[in-house]
Interface confidence: medium
């Protein structure tokens, strides 16, 4: 079987939420059973199409309604021919969208006026991703390349911080971290606390 992908480049870039149809052309077989594979695993999709072009030329379609990050990867199609599995050239599907947070600022409890750090990291594609920091409704830092660490010299009351990630597709806002004041035991002084409270909280990838 002469197997080739047609109508799609080797690298395909699609925006998150958009549909995509991958095509696979099979020549030299009368009744190919075309299966799509993503990163080594057969793709289950009940609506895969076979279109006969001629007796020995078929096109298989794989239709994705709304791509998300988890759809990104390497796709190819395969057919069995005389006990042998023939595979096509792959298509690399890249899914672009607004930045996705891998690290967001974490709630903290710190003594009054004690320095602390908050961390924020977001990824594309597309890259680069830049980070802007907010204290309440006031922009206090950035834009800076992701990942970004915000060094705060101290707070005297409970304060809210968040970060914003920007790329060519738009922006995403992180969770809001609340930095609470820690009660300081009597007889000790807040400015003796010079250790940093580091935040590197990460959450699992959300499905759309």
């Amino acid at each position: 079987a002469g197997l080739k992908l047609m109508g799609a480049p080797v690298k395909l870039t699609v925006s998150q939420g958009q549909p995509v149809k991958l095509n696979c052309s099979v020549e030299g077989m009368e009744e190919p059973d075309i299966q799509w594979v993503k990163d080594g695993a057969v793709v289950q999709n009940l609506d895969q199409l076979y279109i006969p072009v001629s007796e020995q030329h078929w096109i298989g379609f794989l239709s994705l309604k709304s791509v998300e990050r988890s759809d990104a990867g390497r796709y190819w199609c395969q057919v069995e021919d005389g006990g042998e599995t023939e595979i096509s050239q792959p298509v690399w599907l890249t899914v672009e969208g607004v930045p996705f947070f891998t690290v967001e600022p974490k709630d903290l409890a710190v003594p009054p006026n004690a320095p602390f750090q908050l961390s924020c990291e977001a990824v594309g594609p597309p890259e680069p991703v830049t980070i802007v920091w907010w204290r309440g409704t006031t922009k206090i830092g950035g834009p800076a390349p992701s990942p970004s660490v915000l060094n705060v010299t101290g707070v005297t009351q409970s304060t809210m911080f968040s970060c914003e990630a920007h790329n060519l597709k738009g922006l995403a806002s992180s969770r809001t971290a609340t930095v609470h004041l820690q009660l300081v035991p009597r007889g000790s002084s807040a400015h003796h606390h010079h250790h940093h409270h580091h935040s590197a909280w990460s959450h699992p990838q959300f499905e759309k």
Epitope: D33, I51, K208
Partner: antibody
């Protein structure tokens, strides 16, 4: 002209085995998969499963996995739905369904469907 | 197992717009299809891939999908549109398909 001809109505006792058929004509049988759909009296449609005739690859709905078997005979262009042991709750109309796609000059295909007329299966003691 | 949820019934007067909804967690990722079934007949495909009208279906039928909700709209419903309507889609991984419970449309 595309046709899906289903076997006639059948009455069986609980515990009996049964195979109903769906014979396709007017197109190349192996080009498209065939699905089976159940409709109990006065109730809604239920997707049972499907078969890709060219490879005899099957998918089943969770409620039907292990209770029915879908198969196909390429030589007679016929799809089958089989029970080893019928229950009263299997009383229903069973439809076979064939999707198909047509292209205009090789562009994105347009989707069509053919439904068989249905086979009424009654399971009663 | 995966479910698609539809309202059991919708009633409109002739000429009014009827909207039938179908909700399912996988609908952001999987296409919705709509079927019409009149009493004693086999179902007929009305809408495929969320919004494409099937061959021979009047223009007053349209489909849309947003998030976890698909909607079949009949603009200017006719008495002959009285039927049961079913949505159909796949579970998220594409291993099997399901129908919604069906909606009885009454055009009074």
């Amino acid at each position: 002209e595309v046709q899906l001809v289903q076997s006639g109505a059948d009455v069986k006792k609980p515990g009996a085995s049964l195979t109903i058929s769906c014979q396709a004509s007017g197109y190349t049988f192996t080009d498209y998969w065939i699905s089976w759909v159940r409709q109990k009296p006065g109730k809604g449609l239920e997707w049972m499963g499907q078969i890709v005739p060219r490879a005899s690859r099957t998918n089943y709905g969770p409620s039907f996995q292990g209770h029915v078997t879908i198969s196909a005979d390429r030589s007679t262009a016929t799809a089958y739905l089989q029970w080893r042991s019928l229950e009263a709750s299997d009383t229903a109309m069973y439809y076979c369904v064939r999707p198909y796609f047509q292209t205009s000059g090789g562009t994105i295909p347009e989707y069509y469907q053919h439904w068989g007329p249905g086979t009424l299966v009654t399971v009663s003691s | 197992s995966y479910e698609l949820t539809q309202p059991p019934s919708v009633s409109v007067s002739p000429g009014q717009t009827a909207r039938i909804t179908c909700s399912g967690d996988a609908l952001p990722k999987k296409y919705a299809y709509w079927y019409q079934q009149k009493s004693g007949q086999a179902p007929v495909l009305v809408i495929y891939e969320d919004e494409k009208r099937a061959s021979g279906i009047p223009e007053r039928f349209s489909g849309s999908s947003s998030g976890t909700m698909a909607t079949l709209t009949i603009s200017g419903a006719q008495v002959e549109d009285e039927a049961d309507y079913y949505c159909y889609s796949q579970e998220r991984n594409g291993n099997y398909a399901v129908f919604g419970g069906g909606t009885k449309l009454t055009v009074l």
